[in-house]
């Protein structure tokens, strides 16, 4: 059998291999050692007994999509049946105090590979034996601790394979410089050690993508925007656009990246080298946002120019070095660059919203029959922008972290956007008050710290009689800045 017979459904073409040469990988036309690594078809009854206590699942993930030329990393994790795990020596053991269908196991080991004699396996002096080899016959690499690695992983893609000895998790990185663009299939077959041979325990496949477009994601955020994921934002407030480039192998680390923005509102093109940009829309409507990201990435050197037509008679000597038609691709240590582009497009809707909220006045409400521990305070609030439909207040500790009370209620506000919010405070002390005005699309927040002093019946009565003349003795409001809002607090006398 050949590798492609074992690992794939169909024999890949040489064309596929020629166009996708993976460094360090081998052609799947190579022979597979079926004696050492038996091959079972899907549905073969032997799969049921390939692992004690159930089936092992292999989970294959990758950091796809990969920009062509970058490295793509594949990770395979083995998921053992319940209550089983790999120990420090690479043996498979039962977890302590874990009960599965078979109950608690007396034997701590599922597979005790260490116990299997390392001396009596017919090794030569180098520590190499006829069975410490991969399916193609290549010997296992003797890394420190390699004997604790009891799984053989065979990766297969694009008509090529890669073999790796490992534990219950392995990682393989592949350079994509010569990989055809588009979706590709990676298949992995996993074998476990079994005496002097190996037994298949799991097969898994996953699609990965190689692209010549820089994978670009843009997060959009705006102060006071109620839902950042609905692509609806508020007029007259800056929107922050943050560009995230998916480049897990840091292929573009040394590239100059340019960001070219068109916001779709006739403000022209904006070019930046910063991945974050702010833009304010001053009109309502729907706008088409376009971003083009450009990076000079490492790439293949251009092909050499075609040789000049043959001269009629032989030339006596070589011309100067400048006339040498040696192509760039033949120069060793080539360091050419190619412009790669990424694109992002979104349609965003701009609407009116509540732009700002301010507490302009805080007033103690005098009660003729005051409660023993209760103070009522009125907050006079103004806003700019659209008219709010609800108000929420969150009363919390002075650090504004531990919520004590939260209340939301609908409001009916006139065009002037002036409203009074009354809230009760239980007991004296300092409180943080977060006050939020909201409508369908926006939420505007302001915060203030207030101090509520001890109150006794005499002072309350005196306050009632005097028309509130000693309010500053009762509490003081302190200004707090929140999200660059500047709140002007007026004490009412």
């Amino acid at each position: 059998k050949r590798f492609h017979d074992v690992l794939g459904n169909e024999r890949p073409s040489a064309y596929m291999r020629e166009h996708n040469q993976l460094n360090g990988w081998s052609s799947d036309e190579n022979d597979w050692n079926e004696k050492l690594y038996p091959v079972w078809k899907r549905g073969d009854m032997r799969w049921k007994n390939s692992w004690k206590g159930g089936r092992v699942q292999a989970v294959l993930t990758s950091d796809s999509p990969a920009l062509v030329g970058s490295n793509i990393t594949f990770v395979v994790n083995l998921v053992f049946p319940r209550c089983q795990k790999e120990d420090a020596n690479g043996n498979i053991v039962y977890e302590k105090n874990c009960r599965n269908e078979a109950g608690l196991s007396a034997d701590p080991y599922v597979y005790n590979w260490t116990a299997w004699s390392e001396d009596s396996d017919g090794e030569n002096g180098t520590g190499q034996s006829h069975h410490n080899v991969f399916p193609d016959g290549k010997p296992f690499p003797h890394h420190p601790g390699w004997r604790r690695w009891n799984f053989v992983y065979v990766f297969h893609t694009l008509g090529q394979y890669f073999q790796k000895l490992g534990r219950c998790s392995v990682r393989v990185s592949v350079n994509t410089a010569n990989v055809t663009l588009g979706p590709q299939l990676m298949e992995v077959t996993v074998y476990r050690r079994h005496g002097r041979a190996y037994v298949p325990i799991a097969q898994v496949k996953d699609v990965y993508v190689v692209t010549d477009q820089i994978p670009v994601f843009v997060t959009m955020s705006q102060k006071n925007d109620r839902n950042s994921s609905d692509e609806t934002f508020l007029k007259d407030l800056p929107i922050t656009f943050d560009v995230l480039i998916h480049d897990p192998s840091h292929f573009l680390n040394y590239s100059t990246i340019n960001y070219k923005w068109s916001f779709g509102d006739n403000t022209g093109l904006f070019v930046s080298i910063n991945h974050t940009v702010n833009h304010t829309y001053v009109l309502n409507g729907t706008f088409s946002l376009n971003l083009t990201v450009k990076a000079a990435a490492p790439g293949p050197c251009p092909p050499p120019p075609p040789p000049p037509p043959r001269p009629p008679k032989p030339t006596p000597s070589l011309g100067p070095a400048g006339d040498n038609p040696l192509g760039l691709s033949e120069i060793p240590d080539e360091n050419c660059q190619i412009n790669r582009y990424g694109h992002f497009q979104a349609t965003i809707t701009i609407v009116e919203g509540i732009l700002e909220v301010n507490i302009i006045q805080t007033t103690d409400v005098l009660m003729l029959v005051p409660g023993p521990d209760s103070s009522l305070i009125d907050f006079v609030v103004t806003c700019q922008g659209s008219i709010p439909t609800e108000v929420c207040t969150i009363i919390s500790d002075p650090t504004c972290e531990i919520t004590q009370n939260a209340v939301c209620s609908p409001v009916d506000v006139d065009e002037m956007c002036l409203l009074t919010v009354r809230r009760a405070f239980n007991g004296s002390g300092t409180y943080c008050v977060n006050l939020t005005l909201g409508d369908d699309t926006s939420l505007a927040l302001t915060s203030t710290l207030i101090s509520v002093p001890d109150r006794d019946p005499a002072s309350s009565l005196r306050m009632a009689n005097s028309g509130g003349g000693g309010l500053n003795d009762i509490f003081e409001a302190q200004k707090i800045e929140w999200h660059e809002h500047h709140h002007h607090h007026h004490h009412h006398h």
Epitope: R11, S13, T180, P302, P303
Partner: antibody, heavy 119, light 107 residues
Framework: QVQLQQPGAELVKPGASVKLSCRAS????????LHWVKQRPGQGLEWIGE????????NYIEKVKTKATLTVDKSSSTAYMQLSSLTSEDSAVYYC????????????WGQGTLVTVSA | DIVMTQSHKFMSTSVGDRVSITCKAS??????VAWYQQRPGQSPKLLIY???YRYTGVPDRFTGSGSGTDFTFTISSVQAEDLAVYYC?????????FGAGTKLELK
């Protein structure tokens, strides 16, 4: 839909050069290799070479390596084949064709350009 | 280079007949063989790829089979519009090569 557009005909003199174009549309130009196939009048099909529009990599049959040069212009999604030192042997219909990813069969063909080499 | 040999340059047939065209590769190219139809004055049209896979929209009277070095293209019931030249092509390795073509004509 996928289209490969080629000019209908080119008349050139012996010894001259000609640059044939193939404008691609309806797909991501850089994602598929583009191939060129020659067909002399009344004869069969002969593969000339291929180019990867993403990075400019090329492959040619041995006998055209000094005759044909494949290039692309990504900005216009156009592939070119320049033929030099033309002789009557080069008179033929030249097709551009698109391969299927990792597979070198051709689901999409241009209409072909008839090159006539004549004094 | 891999040589693709179509043994018949011409084949005579009648409408409704079953006809098979053969193609032999000079080495194992399995399963990388495609079949094309070319009508006069037109570009070739892909019918079969990877020996036996019918391309999208191709009528099911066209089938492909074979492995190793021997491949067959079959039209189960020839229609008048099927009269054309048929080419095999190996897409196994570079340089890609075509058979010389088989012209299907009316008896």
């Amino acid at each position: 839909q996928v289209q490969l557009q080629q000019p209908g005909a080119e008349l050139v003199k012996p010894g001259a050069s000609v640059k044939l174009s193939c404008r691609a549309s309806g797909y991501t130009f850089t994602s598929y290799w583009l191939h060129w196939v020659k067909q002399r009048p009344g004869q069969g099909l002969e593969w000339i070479g291929e180019i990867n529009p993403s990075d400019g990599r090329t492959n040619y049959i041995e006998k055209v390596k000094t005759k044909a040069t494949l290039t692309v212009d990504k900005s216009s999604s156009t592939a070119y084949m320049q033929l030099s030192s033309l002789t009557s042997e080069d008179s033929a219909v030249y097709y551009c064709a698109r391969s299927g990813g990792n597979y070198a069969w051709f689901a999409y063909w241009g209409q072909g350009t008839l090159v006539t080499v004549s004094a | 280079d891999i040589v693709m040999t179509q043994s018949h340059k011409f084949m005579s047939t009648s409408v409704g007949d079953r006809v098979s065209i053969t193609c032999k590769a000079s080495q194992d190219v399995s399963p990388s063989v495609a079949w094309y139809q070319q009508r006069p004055g037109q570009s070739p049209k892909l019918l079969i790829y990877s020996a036996s896979y019918r391309y999208t929209g191709v009528p099911d009277r066209f089938t492909g089979s074979g492995s190793g070095t021997d491949f067959t293209f079959t039209i189960s019931s020839v229609q008048a519009e099927d009269l054309a030249v048929y080419y095999c092509q190996q897409h196994y390795s570079i340089p890609l090569t075509f058979g010389a073509g088989t012209k299907l004509e009316l008896k």
